[in-house]
Interface confidence: low
Amino acid sequence: LEVQVPEDPVVALVGTDATLCCSFSPEPGFSLAQLNLIWQLTDTKQLVHSFAEGQDQGSAYANRTALFPDLLAQGNASLRLQRVRVADEGSFTCFVSIRDFGSAAVSLQVAAPYSKPSMTLEPNKDLRPGDTVTITCSSYQGYPEAEVFWQDGQGVPLTGNVTTSQMANEQGLFDVHSILRVVLGANGTYSCLVRNPVLQQDAHSSVTITPQRSPTGAVEVQVPEDPVVALVGTDATLRCSFSPEPGFSLAQLNLIWQLTDTKQLVHSFTEGRDQGSAYANRTALFPDLLAQGNASLRLQRVRVADEGSFTCFVSIRDFGSAAVSLQVAAPYSKPSMTLEPNKDLRPGDTVTITCSSYRGYPEAEVFWQDGQGVPLTGNVTTSQMANEQGLFDVHSVLRVVLGANGTYSCLVRNPVLQQDAHGSVTITGQPMTFPPEA
C-alpha cells in the first residue's frame, strides 16, 4: 500500500493550525470499515490519533488533532493539528492498514516570527566622539533561534565586539539580545537585523547617534513609523520611547496609552505607579524599563477587534505624543479542494471546483491558475465571510469545462503577511487525484 506525504517539512506558525497531509490509494470496493489508520510520533511511537473499526477513535494528543472524516473514503488520511506549539516540532508517522499496509513520515517545522527589534543605548546622553557605547538590540518571541547581523550606515557588516544571547521561555520561544560595543565617530547609524532562518523573515531596527546635541527640553516621543503586525492570539508590543532629562524620576512621569480615534483609555502610569489596564486586562507596561524612557505597551492575546491606532502620551515637564498602528493578521489555512460532480467525468463536462481556506485576516486575495501557470479569471466566484472573532473563511468557486485532463490550482494570499496558501486538484478523466505537496 503506497502512503504518500509531503517530502518537505510542513512549516506552521506557533498558535495556528497545521495540516499534516497523508494520502493512500483505496482499492475498488474499499469501505471505511476496513480502514485502520494511526498517526504517531515517529521517534517515541506515542499515539496521536487513530481511526479503526469504521470509527474515528479521537485524539490522543492533548485533544488538538482531528482527521478529515469526509475525505477518508477518498484516501485522504491527513491530520489537522490545532494551536501548534514549539513542542509539537518533529516527525509524525501516518500508518495505514487495509489488506496491505504502509506508512510514511512527515516533518513538522514550527516557526514564530521575531518582533521588530528594540534598540537601547548605554550611556544614552552627553555623548562625544571617541566615547565607547553599548548598543543593545532585543527581539522577542521567535522560533527557531535567530541569526543576528549588525551593520553601519553604509551597509558594512560590524562583526567585532558583538555578543548575542538567546533564551527560550516556557513556550520554547526565543528572546534574542545582541550587544554591540562601538567607539563613536562624529555621528553614525547602527542597524541590527534579526533573521528567522525558517520563515526567511528579517526584522530590522536602527539607531542614529549624533553626539552632543544641544538639549531642547522637549519630550520627544518616538514610535515605529510602520504598523506593528501581530498574529491573532499572540502578544504584540507597541513600541514607544521618550528621552528622559537628567535627574528624571518616575514620580514625575505621566503616561497614557489610549485609542487614537475614540480616546478610550487603554493603560496609564501616574504618580509614580502603574495604574493598570483599562482594556480588558490584556495590557502591561515594562516597569523595569520606564526609567530609561521605554514606555512600550504589551498587548496580550491579540484579537481582530484590536486593530487600529494607539496613542502614547507622555508628560513630564514638557509633554508629547505619538500614534502607532496595530495591524492584525491571521494566516489562512491550506485550501481544501472539492469537485462537483466528482465521478464519471468526461472531457467536455462542466465541473465546479471549490477552494476553501479558513480563519484568516484580513480578507484574502484568491487566484486560480491552470497546470501551466496561466491565470483563470472567467467563471470565478469568491465569497468571504467573517466569523464572530472577525476571521474570514474564504470560498472560491471555479466553473470549468474539462479538457482531456488538467490541473487547477487555487492560491489564497494574505496581503499583510505576504503568505500564500496553495491547493490544487488534477482531473484525469477518472478518477481524480490530489497531488502531494511539492
Epitope: F149, G155, P197, Q200
Partner: nanobody, 113 residues
C-alpha cells in the same frame, strides 16, 4: 556570442549594500518581446525558483563572500538569444518584475544556430 548547444555562465556583482540580506533574480528580454522571468535565488542561497520552461537547463547560485550571483546556462538554443538582467528582490513573488527594487544594466547573449 555562442553556438547552439554551448554552455555559458553569467555573473552579477552587487555593491553598496548587505548583499547576503537580499534575494536576487534573473530576467531576460528577447528582441521584440517583453522581459520575462528566468530564475531567482534566496538570500542565503538555500532556495531557488525557476521559470517552468528553463528549469533543468539553467541553474542559479551565489557566493555571498564575493557579493556575486551566477546564472549557469546549458544546452543553449537560438531562442535563448536575449539581453539578460540581474536584479535585487524586494517584497513580492519572485517571478514578478514589480517585486524587484534594483536592476543591472543587462548583458547581451546571442546564440548562433
Amino acid at each position: 556570442l555562442v553556438q547552439d548547444g554551448d554552455s555559458l555562465r553569467l555573473s552579477c556583482k552587487a555593491s553598496g549594500g548587505t548583499f547576503s540580506s537580499y534575494a536576487m533574480g534573473w530576467f531576460r528580454q528577447a528582441p521584440g518581446q517583453e522581459r520575462e522571468f528566468v530564475a531567482a535565488i534566496s538570500s542565503e542561497g538555500g532556495s531557488t525558483y525557476y521559470a517552468d520552461n528553463m528549469e533543468g537547463r539553467f541553474t542559479t547560485s551565489r557566493d555571498n563572500a564575493k557579493n556575486t550571483v551566477y546564472l549557469q546556462m546549458n544546452s543553449l538554443k537560438p531562442e535563448d538569444t536575449a539581453v539578460y538582467y540581474c536584479a535585487v528582490k524586494g517584497v513580492g513573488w519572485p517571478q514578478e518584475q514589480a517585486s524587484y527594487d534594483y536592476w543591472g544594466q543587462g548583458t547581451q547573449v546571442t546564440v548562433k544556430p
